[in-house]
Each structure stands twice: as C-alpha cells, then as structure tokens.
C-alpha cells in the first residue's frame, strides 16, 4: 500500500440520500394521488377495494414517535418492492379499459424503482440490515374480468397512497435522528 491519500467525495452522503428519498417519496405521493383521482373519475369505485397480496399498512399516526431508522427503511423497502411488482403485474394484466392509463402507470413504476434504489443505497451507506424482499403473492394470471383489473388498480393505488403518506412522515422524522 502506498502513502495515505485522500479520496474525492462521491456524489452524496447518507443525509443527502435521506433528503433525496424524502423528495422522491413526496413526488411519488403526488403522482399516486393524481393517478388515483383519474381512476376514480374514469372508473368510479363502489366502496373500498382490497387485494390479499398487498402489504398491510406498516404504521399508524400513533406509532410514528417510536420509529427506528432500521425498521422504517427495511419495512418501507419491502412494502414498496411489493407495490412495484403489483404495478408491474397491473400493467401486464390490464385489459383495454386500463390501457389509457399506461403512460402514467409506466412513469409510476419508473419512479418507484428510483426510490427503491435510493433507499437501498441509504441502507448500504448506513450498513443497516437489508432483508431480501419476499416475492409477493401477486394474484396469479390475469384478473377474472375487466372490472377485476379496475378493482385491483383501485386497491393498488389506494394502498400505495397510504404507504407513501406514512413514508413521508416517517422519513422526515428520521432526518432529525441521523
């Protein structure tokens, strides 16, 4: 080994990664909100829709105060990976009725992927445990009907909206602890 030499700074550090994750999450939340509103306009929902394969909401307002960095990031990454795969599935399985929303769903998927990469980079830089995301039990095959894919879309976008909402709050809280 040669004499000690300094390394130039790389593009970001963990705190900048966290800032970036907050911005990406906020932006994704706005996209999801907008897309969910479009869905409601085009295909009015008759009550709440659910998919058994979607992750259950990780946090409630009451638990925000006790959040720990590793738990939040791990859970957020696993849940977002599940939503990413559900959006992928939705784009593949969607009938003609949902094809009109394909550009928006494609953009949503790309943004989700960016956020997932940023979260993983943050976890790597902090050296936090990185559990391998389980493959979600995505419904097998295409939905039974066109209405089935519309109901699935309502459920996916609704769940993602709630997840991103707590994610923004959780990440902002974590910023104060890093």
């Amino acid at each position: 080994p040669g004499p000690p030499a300094g390394s130039p700074r790389v593009s970001s550090d963990p705190r900048a990664d966290l800032d970036s994750a907050v911005l990406l999450t906020r932006s994704l939340l706005a996209d999801t909100r907008q897309l969910a509103a479009q869905m409601r306009d085009k295909f009015p929902a008759d009550g709440d829709h659910n998919l058994d394969s979607l992750p259950t909401l990780a946090m409630s307002a009451g638990t925000l105060g006790s959040l720990q960095l590793p738990g939040v990031l791990t859970r957020l990454r696993v849940d977002l990976m599940s939503y990413f795969r559900h959006v992928q599935w939705l784009r593949r399985a969607a009938g003609p009725s949902l094809k009109t929303l394909e550009p928006e769903l494609g953009a949503l998927q790309a943004r989700l992927e960016r956020l997932l990469r940023r979260l993983q980079l943050l976890m790597s830089r902090l050296a936090l445990p990185q559990a391998a995301p389980d493959q979600p039990a995505v419904p097998l095959g295409p939905p039974a009907s066109a209405w089935g894919s519309i109901r699935a879309a309502h459920a996916i976008l609704g769940g993602l909206h709630l997840t991103l909402d707590w994610a923004v709050r959780g990440l902002l809280l974590l910023k104060t602890r890093l």
């Epitope: 963990p14 590793p70 990469r117 993983q120 790597s124 050296a127 990185q130 995301p133 890093l178």
Partner: antibody
Framework: EVQLLESGGGLVQPGGSLRLSCAAS????????MHWVRQAPGKGLEWVAV????????YYADSVKGRFTISRDNSKNTLYLQMNSLRAEDTAVYYC???????WGQGTLVTVSS | QSVLTQPPSASGTPGQRVTISCSGS?????????VHWYQQLPGTAPKLLIY???ERPSGVPDRFSGSKSGTSASLAISGLRSEDEADYYC???????????FGGGTKLTVLG
C-alpha cells in the same frame, strides 16, 4: 477531502492478537456504516466485517466469526478491528472502508507467521 | 471461490470498448440488491467506480458505465486508455451473509 488512515498492522505469530485502528476525517463519520475488507497477497478482495453508523449492527464473514470484533468510537472518528486467534490465512492487507463502500483507506499489512 | 463470478481477465486495444461481466445468485444480485464496481490500480487501494448499478461518482469519466439484469451485471469501458489497466471488482449485498460480497476480480490489460 476524505481520509481513512489504518494503523496497527505488523508481524504476529499464529494464535496471537492484533488491534487495527482506522482514523477518519473529511466526512461525517457517524453517518456512515464502516467496513473492514482484506486482500491476501496477489488475491482478490474479501469482506471481513461491517458495523452500522451507530454501532448497533455488526456482521462478520464466516471465516472470522468468533475471532474478530469490529467496533467504533464516533466521538473519536475511529474504527477498530480486534483480531484474536490469528491464523496464517489471515495474512493480508486490511482496508478500512466507509459506506457502500464509497471511500477506502490505503490499507495496513498484517502478517501471521512463526 | 468468490460468491460473485467475474472473468479472471479481459483485454482490449486503445479506443476499443470492453465489457466485464459479474454473475450472482438469488441471494445477492438476483434479490434486487444493487451492484457496485471498483477499480484497483496496481499497488493502490480500490476506488468506487460505479454505484447502484449505473451511477457514477463525481470525477469518474462517462466512458465507464454499468448495468444490471436479473442475477448478473456488467461494467462497460468505452474509448479504452492505457491508464484503465487495472483490476476491476463487482460487489453486492448478500442476504444470506448479511454483508457485501465481491467478485474474484478481472484483470484488464490494454494491449499495444
């Protein structure tokens, strides 16, 4: 400019102990997970151990588990590696590295030989 | 034997484009973990070249690019130069080891 400066390497007999230190400067040490990575002469890189930014998580390669202990002192911007029950196959240059790792020190040579 | 598999050597002439592959498994690259690439010039410490599959740290020329697909990744170097002669390592987190794993390294030789 980021600097990681390892020290504590040297010649030690099999079964002996050594403590490596790594002094960090030029970045927020307490915000980064820290690694030890080693490279045997003429060989590739082998990850040894990692400690999370706050010291709450520590992981080790199977080859050093139970013999090596990684620790850090964020108030001193310093990373440590306590190496016990050293074997000939532990002979290598030991690098201290931060983050992904994003930054690497220049390394310190540990020779285990009788 | 390394957890990630790289070809032991690669070569090219100045100006050429060379690609170095890195093959993993379902517990590392295939498990949606990002791949990072390092360059180690003779007698020096490794240096981060590509992170998060395709991102370049500041100061790394855009001749270097990375990509990832499934359980493998690759590093491409275009407009090869003599100073690119070095060892190149890929790395990714491995869930079964709870730590990063490295490829065995690829020695790049610039001919002529």
């Amino acid at each position: 400019e980021v600097q990681l400066l390892e020290s504590g390497g040297g010649l030690v007999q099999p079964g002996g102990s050594l403590r490596l230190s790594c002094a960090a400067s030029g970045f927020t040490f307490s915000s980064y997970g820290m690694h030890w990575v080693r490279q045997a002469p003429g060989k590739g890189l082998e990850w040894v151990a990692v400690i999370s930014y706050d010291g709450s998580y520590k992981y080790y390669a199977d080859s050093v588990k139970g013999r090596f202990t990684i620790s850090r002192d964020n108030s001193k911007n310093t990373l440590y590696l306590q190496m016990n029950s050293l074997r000939a196959e532990d002979t290598a240059v030991y690098y201290c590295a931060a983050g992904v790792p994003d930054y690497w020190g220049q390394g310190t040579l540990v020779t285990v030989s009788s | 034997q390394s957890v990630l598999t790289q070809p032991p050597s690669a070569s090219g002439t100045p100006g050429q484009r060379v690609t170095i592959s890195c093959s993993g498994s379902s517990s590392n690259i295939g498990s949606d973990y990002d791949v990072h690439w390092y360059q180690q010039l003779p007698g020096t410490a490794p240096k981060l070249l590509i992170y998060s599959n395709e991102e370049r740290p500041s100061g790394v020329p855009d001749r270097f690019s990375g990509s990832k697909s499934g359980t493998s990744a690759s590093l491409a170097i275009s407009g090869l130069r003599s100073e690119d002669e070095a060892d190149y390592y890929c790395s990714a987190w491995d869930s079964s080891l709870s730590g990063p794993v490295f490829g065995g390294g690829t020695k790049l030789t610039v001919l002529g």
